[in-house]
């Protein structure tokens, strides 16, 4: 065909409002004189003696010019049909990247402006290198590589196996039949890391302790199951109808609240962050509710079988908290991380 096919569906040619457009008759050889008509309209738009051969020139197109055009050779044989669609070249897409763990990150994008045309995105990334490697050939380990687009979520690609300490450059190029436009974004995993909120938050009363609540939770499922880098947590709680949250930073995966308001239900929520403060705090987990126990502590049952109970008096000094689950960082990785 003498008409180079722009990216997009066959038989469609593209233009920009307010600009000239040159349409091309697809079924004839280059330079063959043709007549042009609007589909369904017998009025001649451009005759075979125009000197433009198989091309139709429209000086300044606008929305009424969109539609189907028919070209015919001198002997009246149809040279084919062309549909003109108007739109705009791509603007730079807006790109942002997020990470919910320290090994992978995802980038999402949206068009800088709506082009009104069929659009696709080319996504790739490479590891940025330190300056000064003049004498060395660039290592293949720096890429570039494609950033695989998520088949289930449009406008998202995921980089797997990223290095926590490296910096990456993301390239998102928006392509449509009128052109291409590229956005670049430099990304450090340690800067964009924002864990998912902790999961499985439970709030339980502590029998016999009317001012205590025990909250426990687990790591978010998206965090690696045998983590080199740990999470730290922030816990907030408040009695029902109380506007202000109290905040504590627990040492592990549970916390005993010792100043709960007796008899009132309490809302509790937790947030997570990398244990060495990379990135930012997660969003808060969904609130869980719990009410301190109102009962008393059963004492030792005497030999004669009579049950003695004694009302609880909250001790001045709290009894030791239950042992924390051990999740200590791997010392070599800690050393490595401290040394950077």
């Amino acid at each position: 065909s003498p008409c180079p096919q722009a990216w997009g569906p066959p038989g469609v040619q593209y233009g920009q409002p307010g600009r000239p457009v040159m349409l091309c008759c697809p079924g004839v050889s280059a330079g063959t004189p043709v007549s042009w008509f609007r589909d369904g309209d017998s009025r001649l738009l451009q005759g075979p003696d125009s000197g433009l051969g198989h091309r139709l020139v429209l000086a300044q197109v606008d929305s009424p010019d969109e539609g189907t055009y028919v070209c015919q050779t001198l002997d009246g044989v149809s040279g084919g049909m062309v549909t003109l669609k108007l739109g705009f070249p791509p603007a730079r897409p807006e790109v942002s990247c997020q990470a919910v763990d320290y090994e992978n990150f995802s980038c999402t994008w949206s068009p800088g402006q709506v082009s009104g045309l069929p659009t696709r995105y080319l996504t790739s990334y490479r590891k940025k290198t330190l300056p000064g490697a003049e004498s060395q050939r660039e290592s293949p380990s720096t890429g570039p590589w494609p950033c695989p687009q998520d088949p289930l979520e449009a406008s998202r690609c995921v980089v797997h196996g990223a290095e926590f300490w490296s910096e990456y450059r993301i390239n998102v190029t928006e392509v449509n039949p009128l052109g291409a436009s590229t956005s670049l974004l430099d990304v450090r995993l340690q800067s964009i890391l924002r864990p998912d909120p902790p999961q499985g938050l439970r709030v339980e009363s502590v029998p016999g302790y009317p001012r205590r609540l025990r909250a426990s939770w687990t790591y978010p499922a998206s965090w690696p199951s045998q983590p080199h880098f740990l999470l730290k947590f922030r816990l907030q709680y408040r009695p029902a109808q109380h506007p202000a949250w109290s905040t504590v930073e627990p040492a592990g995966l549970e916390e005993v609240i010792t100043d709960a308001v007796a008899g009132l239900p309490h809302a509790v929520r937790v947030s997570a962050r990398d244990f060495l403060d990379a990135g930012t705090w997660s969003t808060w987990s969904p609130e869980a509710w719990g009410t301190p126990s109102t009962g008393t502590i059963p004492k030792e049952i005497p030999a004669w079988g009579q049950l003695h109970t004694q009302p609880e008096v909250e001790p001045q000094v709290d009894s030791p908290a239950p042992p924390r689950p051990s999740l200590q960082p791997h010392p070599r990785l800690l050393d490595h991380r401290d040394s950077v």
Partner: antibody, heavy 126, light 112 residues
């Protein structure tokens, strides 16, 4: 080896034109910002022009704006500087240089030229 | 785009330190952390010594260090050696027209 090789310099009359080329090798050219820097005989370095990896954005020193055009062909790993309306004060060694740049969500910034070519001499004289 | 201001010359004996200043404005040096320093020997292309104010490329000795305060950046060469005799240029992102700006250059002489 990471390398930049300039060509196209020479003697040209005032008002004339010249096109400089810079062939890049040993790195993924299409991912880097590139620039031209010049140095008049016995003088200091002067920033001339700068281009984004895709070629979509460019920048120029005030002294060359409207007369010089920077461009690149990523398929050929080549950077160009088209110079028109040349003046005697454009006489200099022209260096091509590479920059990794820094790109935030809002803008990209010139960072530092880490790789330089050997330079090509442009002499504007009648 | 006015050139950044550097002293025309600086000197020191081998083993001594020499500091070179680079003064700009809030639109260049003061406004961004994209200040770099280059060394140029006669007849050769410039070589990157410092980027992003304080960072050293691989292969550059730690005798070279950079800093910045306000609108003025500085390069310090400690433990001067004969091969440090060269011209030194600072550069900064210029904040306009996607352009940058170089300093006026400083010739460093190693005495003796």
């Amino acid at each position: 080896e990471v390398q930049l090789l300039e060509s196209g310099g020479g003697l040209v009359q005032p008002g004339g034109s010249l096109r400089l080329s810079c062939a890049a090798s040993g790195f993924t050219f299409s991912w880097y910002f590139m620039g031209w820097v010049r140095q008049a005989p016995g003088k200091g370095l002067e920033w001339v022009s700068y281009i984004y990896p895709s070629g979509g954005s460019t920048g120029y020193a005030d002294s060359v704006k409207g007369r010089f055009t920077i461009s690149r062909d990523n398929s050929k790993n080549t950077l160009y500087l088209q110079m028109h309306s040349l003046r005697a004060e454009d006489t200099a060694v022209y260096y091509c240089a590479r920059d990794e740049g820094y790109c935030s969500s809002t803008s990209c910034y010139f960072d530092a030229f880490d790789i330089w070519g050997q330079g090509t001499m442009v002499t504007v004289s009648s | 785009q006015s050139a950044l201001t550097q002293p025309p010359s600086a000197s020191g004996s081998p083993g001594q330190s020499v500091a070179i200043s680079c003064t700009g404005t809030s639109s260049d040096v003061g406004g961004y952390n994209f200040v770099s320093w280059y060394q140029q020997h006669p007849g050769k292309a410039p070589k990157l010594l410092i980027y992003e104010v304080t960072k050293r490329p691989s292969g550059v000795p730690d005798r070279f260090s950079g800093s910045k305060a306000g609108n003025t950046a500085s390069l310090t060469v400690s433990g001067l050696q004969a091969e440090d005799e060269a011209d030194y240029y600072c550069s900064s992102y210029g904040g306009s027209n996607n352009a940058g700006v170089f300093g006026t250059g400083t010739k460093v002489t190693v005495l003796g």
